[in-house]
């Protein structure tokens, strides 16, 4: 007969998993804040910039109290997938001006990807229903000009910063309910 079966696999403490997700999110938040500041120094923003293809902010800070874990993680994952796509697009189509933000933009993309994988893992460990596969998103049109790429970068980093700030608050609040 084969080797004796190993001990039953104990699922890690979900609070520890959530802690690890909070740490990654907070680290990415600080990176994003710094990169957005770097962008403002290199290319000062003339007012607020928006990009229609970006997700709307998931939740105001005041509404955090009503959050439920499955909803938060599902929405956060969807929003971060959108931001990952936008960062990839920015690096590919943003133009030569934005090359000055490398390698930081590449590091941001890698950490965003890592956070998404961590969220996926957390959802499976918590036995949450897995979201359906993402429908293929329509391709993002290249910026109309170099300045268009810079405006897009301001919008993407600003939106990502707000989303991650919301995520840290939400995840910490949810941790108290586990």
């Amino acid at each position: 007969p084969g080797p004796p079966p190993g001990p039953p696999r104990v699922s890690p403490d979900p609070r520890a998993e959530l802690d690890s997700t909070v740490l990654l999110t907070r680290s990415l938040l600080a990176d994003t804040r710094q990169l957005a500041a770097q962008l403002r120094d290199k290319f000062p923003a003339d007012g607020d910039h928006n990009l229609d293809s970006l997700p709307t902010l998931a939740m105001s800070a005041g509404a955090l109290g009503a959050l439920q874990l499955p909803g938060v993680l599902t929405r956060l994952r969807a929003d971060l997938l959108s931001y990952l796509r936008h960062v990839q697009w920015l690096r590919r189509a943003g133009g030569s001006s934005l090359k000055t933000l490398e390698p930081e933009l590449g590091t941001l993309q890698a950490r965003l990807d890592r956070l998404l994988r961590r969220l996926q893992l957390l959802m499976s460990r918590l036995a949450l229903p897995q979201p359906p596969p993402d429908p293929p998103a329509p391709p993002l049109a290249p910026p109309s000009s170099a300045w268009g790429g810079i405006r897009a970068a301001h919008a993407i980093l600003g939106g990502l910063h707000l989303t991650l700030d919301w995520a840290v608050r939400g995840l910490l609040l949810l941790k108290t309910r586990l």
């Epitope: 907070r26 403002r40 120094d41 910490l172």
Partner: antibody
Framework: EVQLVESGGGLVQPGGSLRLSCAAS????????MHWVRQAPGKGLEWVAY????????YYADTVKGRFTISRDNAKNSLYLQMNSLRAEDTAVYYC?????????????WGQGTLVTVSS | EIVLTQSPATLSLSPGERATLSCSVS???????LHWYQQKPGQAPRLLIY???NLASGIPARFSGSGSGTDFTLTISSLEPEDFAVYYC?????????FGQGTKLEIK
């Protein structure tokens, strides 16, 4: 050798104003974010304000927001702190500090400090 | 705001002994944003350890840092007379950047 030298401290009445300066040398000033940190007599350290290399992002502690203004002149290798509406609790030694090489590596270089006393 | 609480407030030890200083953080923070400083009377603070465990330039190897999440430690393996000072931890992940209240390391 990195050097930071603060000046401009002194005795000022409550409600008054003061402008601190920090002269930087020994490094490319325009490449680094800069901070002001203060220390009340016999107390601990308190972060006051931060400015990015190009001055386009600025952060303040809540205790000074709306009263203090951080600025810099890269051509003069100088950092400033304009302090208005001063209160007794602003009495402290004020240090300028430079981040290490990356923003997440702490305050690696400090000046010797300049004492601000707010008293009537 | 993230609050850092240092313990003990005062630590009385003799030269040659091992010192262990603690910094407890109110929120989870990534270790790369936790730093330690030393300050002697009448002097500016000096960066000792950055990113929780990296020795700053010119700092002797008897100093070391460790920890993660909410609990961080500064260790001095064998105290030298010049190590008696006040030690501060500081977080740089969130604005406002904050310091602990300090631990005074005094000669027993």
């Amino acid at each position: 050798e990195v050097q930071l030298v603060e000046s401009g401290g002194g005795l000022v009445q409550p409600g008054g104003s003061l402008r601190l300066s920090c002269a930087a040398s020994g490094f490319t000033f325009s490449s680094f974010g800069m901070h002001w940190v203060r220390q009340a007599p016999g107390k601990g350290l308190e972060w006051v304000a931060y400015i990015t290399p190009g001055s386009n992002t600025i952060y303040y502690a809540d205790t000074v927001k709306g009263r203090f203004t951080i600025s810099r002149d890269n051509a003069k290798n100088s950092l400033y702190l304009q302090m208005n509406s001063l209160r007794a609790e602003d009495t402290a030694v004020y240090y300028c500090a430079r981040e290490y090489y990356s923003y997440d590596e702490g305050f690696a270089y400090w000046g010797q400090g300049t004492l601000v006393t707010v008293s009537s | 705001e993230i609050v850092l609480t240092q313990s003990p407030a005062t630590l009385s030890l003799s030269p040659g002994e091992r010192a262990t200083l603690s910094c407890s953080v109110s929120d989870l923070i990534p270790s790369q944003y936790l730093h330690w400083y030393q300050q002697k009377p009448g002097q500016a603070p000096r960066l000792l350890i950055y990113r929780a465990s990296n020795l700053a330039s010119g700092i002797p190897a008897r100093f070391s840092g460790s920890g993660s999440g909410t609990d961080f430690t500064l260790t001095i393996s064998s105290l030298e007379p010049e190590d008696f000072a006040v030690y501060y931890c500081q977080q740089g992940v969130d604005v406002p950047f904050t310091f602990g209240q300090g631990t005074k390391l005094e000669i027993k």
